[in-house]
Amino acid sequence: QPDAINAPVTCCYNFTNRKISVQRLASYRRITSSKCPKEAVIFKTIVAKEICADPKQKWVQDSMDHLDKQIQTPKP
């Protein structure tokens, strides 16, 4: 889970070790702050949970691409 002890900066200290289906993802944001120990992606899921993921993993990159495309092509 993301940790925001030093609000307003949210950092990730651990990454999920399970792939999440894109069908469960609602949005994402990148964590690039120098105040954080590592770069990360935080996925917001359809059940309102936020999950930290490793941006170096292929499934994470594919999921971000998928979500980006969803934003670019809004549903009619």
Partner: antibody, heavy 119, light 109 residues
Framework: QVELVQSGAEVKKPGSSVKVSCKAS????????ISWVRQAPGQGLEWMGA????????HYAQKFQGRVTITADESTSTAYMELSSLRSEDTAVYYC????????????WGQGTLVTVSS | DIVLTQSPATLSLSPGERATLSCRAS???????LAWYQQKPGQAPRLLIY???SRATGVPARFSGSGSGTDFTLTISSLEPEDFAVYYC??????????FGQGTKVEIK
């Protein structure tokens, strides 16, 4: 260790309703969903519906739509399943089971509640 | 809805033998969102395998899962006396409903 404890066996008349409870302990109740699964005597598992308190989502299997209501009380870490318009075919063991809403495998189960519908 | 068909309905084997159980989906279970459960008489089901191939906590190594798309397999490498039970597969990619297969009974020959 997560534990789900269900209410006791019930005997009901056709046409009536039953409400089964499922009290969770040993985990963060609101972070997980609760599914309800039933098993008629000698039959397989049948998914009825689920609630995810964190997201405020409730889902029902089409077969039970309009007849089942699933609720949760976060203050007591308890989920409820109410089934109305009971008929003899609803005689079954009813299980609650926990799942992570991001995934869906049922990792902890209640002990089951036998509901007998008989006139 | 995704329909799961398990085969065989009953598997008659002796302790020490290898058991291979099949679960076929009517459409692709993407991301291998498929689980296997064991149920013994009078007991609640117990999770064995999730994400098609990951063993749940405390499950012996003789249980393994494999497969993707529409074809999944649960293998018990060497049956122990306590493994004789009914096994169910379940998909959780559709939300809802989560659906179960009809079960495979593994009985002593």
């Amino acid at each position: 260790q997560v534990e789900l404890v269900q209410s006791g066996a019930e005997v009901k008349k056709p046409g009536s309703s039953v409400k089964v409870s499922c009290k969770a302990s040993g985990g963060t109740f609101s972070s997980y969903g609760i599914s309800w699964v039933r098993q008629a005597p000698g039959q397989g598992l049948e998914w009825m519906g689920a609630i995810n308190p964190l997201a405020g989502h409730t889902h029902y299997a089409q077969k039970f739509q309009g007849r089942v209501t699933i609720t949760a009380d976060e203050s007591t870490s308890t989920a409820y399943m109410e089934l109305s318009s009971l008929r003899s075919e609803d005689t079954a063991v009813y299980y609650c089971a926990r799942y992570d809403g991001i995934y869906g495998e049922l990792d902890f189960w209640g002990q089951g509640t036998l509901v007998t519908v008989s006139s | 809805d995704i329909v799961l068909t398990q085969s065989p309905a009953t598997l008659s084997l002796s302790p020490g033998e290898r058991a291979t159980l099949s679960c076929r989906a009517s459409q692709s279970v993407s991301d291998a969102y498929l689980a296997w459960y064991q149920q013994k008489p009078g007991q609640a089901p117990r999770l064995l395998i999730y994400d098609a191939s990951s063993r749940a906590t405390g499950v012996p190594a003789r249980f393994s899962g494999s497969g993707s798309g529409t074809d999944f397999t649960l293998t018990i490498s060497s049956l122990e006396p306590e493994d004789f039970a009914v096994y169910y597969c379940q998909q959780y990619i559709t939300y809802p409903p989560f659906t179960f297969g009809q079960g495979t009974k593994v009985e002593i020959k």
